[in-house]
């Protein structure tokens, strides 16, 4: 379809780099959530940091190209990196408007499919880009 994809846009304070240039921020009449219309893909992404007690959103926005996973209708995150001991970054890609607003589910920390404690370690800023 020719219509462009629109995604939720968010970048947590302290996250290095930005995906803002991958789209055009929209005026939605409300402060949050912000919306971004993708320029180079029809695909949204989301990154959440899962610790023992909670999941915290790190980034949401547009991908720079359509890749495997972008055909998903919903955000089904998968584990990607360990920014620090006891926390895991989960990412999703999906291809419907605002599909990255929230995830359908997150596996509990340490469950099958989650990288073990010996998984890749990264400095806080770098871990986001590893996840992307």
């Amino acid at each position: 379809p020719p219509n462009r994809r629109t995604c939720v846009f968010f970048e947590a304070p302290g996250v290095r780099g930005s995906t803002k240039t991958l789209g055009e921020l929209l005026d939605t009449g409300t402060e949050l959530p912000r919306a971004i219309r993708c320029l180079y893909s029809r695909c949204c992404f989301g990154i959440w940091n899962l610790t023992q007690d909670r999941a915290q959103v790190e980034m949401q926005g547009c991908r720079d190209s359509d890749e495997p996973g972008c055909e998903s209708l919903h955000c089904d995150p998968s584990p990607r990196a360990h920014p620090s001991p006891g926390s895991t970054l989960f990412t999703c890609s999906c291809g419907t408007d605002f599909c990255n607003a929230n995830y359908s589910h997150l596996p509990p920390p340490g469950s099958p499919g989650t990288p073990g404690s010996q998984g890749p370690q990264a400095a806080p800023g770098e871990s986001i880009w590893m996840a992307l």
């Epitope: 462009r4 009449g29 320029l39």
Partner: antibody
Framework: QVQLQESGPGLVKPSETLSLTCTVS?????????WNWIRQFPGKGLEWMGY???????SYNPSLKSRITISRDTSKNQFFLQLSSVTAEDTAVYYC??????????WGQGTLVTVSS | DIVLTQSPSSLSASVGDRVTITCRAS??????????MHWYQQKPGQPPKLLIY???NLESGIPARFSGSGSGTDFTLTISSVQPEDFATYYC?????????FGGGTKVEIK
């Protein structure tokens, strides 16, 4: 300041391939932006042909999709247009343009390409 | 493809006149209340020059006598008091849907 300059043959024979180069100065084509080709027919109508993005992905006008290729040489900060099987209807002024958003803020001066035997 | 129809195709004006050009789209060019319609000015032998983006935002360096308005399918470019350097051809462009398309142009001539 972003500057763009088109270059290439001004005359192409029918059925051959039109090849143009856009040289970008003042900005790296891998930093940001979509790098577009737009043409203007003798009747003054404008047509967006396609782009190559800073990351190398491409998007083409479906009306040209079977004939158009846009590529780049990042070491020379250039991007290219190839349009195959040209006819007289492809005679136009060809512009390269840079766009941070979905409108075109930066344009080259344009180069006239005539398709004729 | 979205077809953009500009009217009039040409007009004559005197310096100081208020000039209004319209652009009608074959379908809405809005996304969640944001209008993806843009306006350009072109003089002979030059490339188009961006004037207005997203319906009503004035590009940096463009005089305030230029303004844009509209939403959905109907858009207007207004020159509040036309100056000698404004005699040119004006184009609208939509970017709400691929492929991007342009209007046929409106030539503003000196009366």
């Amino acid at each position: 300041q972003v500057q763009l300059q088109e270059s290439g043959p001004g005359l192409v024979k029918p059925s051959e391939t039109l090849s143009l180069t856009c040289t970008v100065s003042g900005y790296s084509i891998t930093s940001d932006f979509a790098w577009n080709w737009i043409r203007q027919f003798p009747g003054k109508g404008l047509e967006w042909m396609g782009y190559i993005s800073f990351s190398g992905s491409t998007s083409y006008n479906p009306s040209l999709k079977s004939r158009i290729t846009i590529s780049r040489d990042t070491s020379k900060n250039q991007f290219f247009l190839q349009l195959s099987s040209v006819t007289a209807e492809d005679t136009a002024v060809y512009y390269c343009a840079g766009s941070r958003y979905s409108w075109f803020a930066y344009w080259g001066q344009g180069t006239l390409v005539t398709v004729s035997s | 493809d979205i077809v953009l129809t500009q009217s009039p195709s040409s007009l004559s004006a005197s310096v100081g006149d208020r000039v209004t050009i319209t652009c009608r789209a074959s379908e809405s060019v809005d996304t969640y209340g944001n209008s993806f319609m843009h306006w350009y000015q072109q003089k002979p032998g030059q490339p188009p020059k961006l004037l207005i983006y997203r319906a009503s935002n004035l590009e940096s360096g463009i005089p305030a006598r230029f303004s844009g308005s509209g939403s959905g399918t109907d858009f207007t470019l207004t020159i509040s008091s036309v100056q000698p350097e404004d005699f040119a051809t004006y184009y609208c462009q939509q970017s709400n849907e691929d492929p991007y398309t342009f209007g046929g142009g409106t030539k503003v001539e000196i009366k």
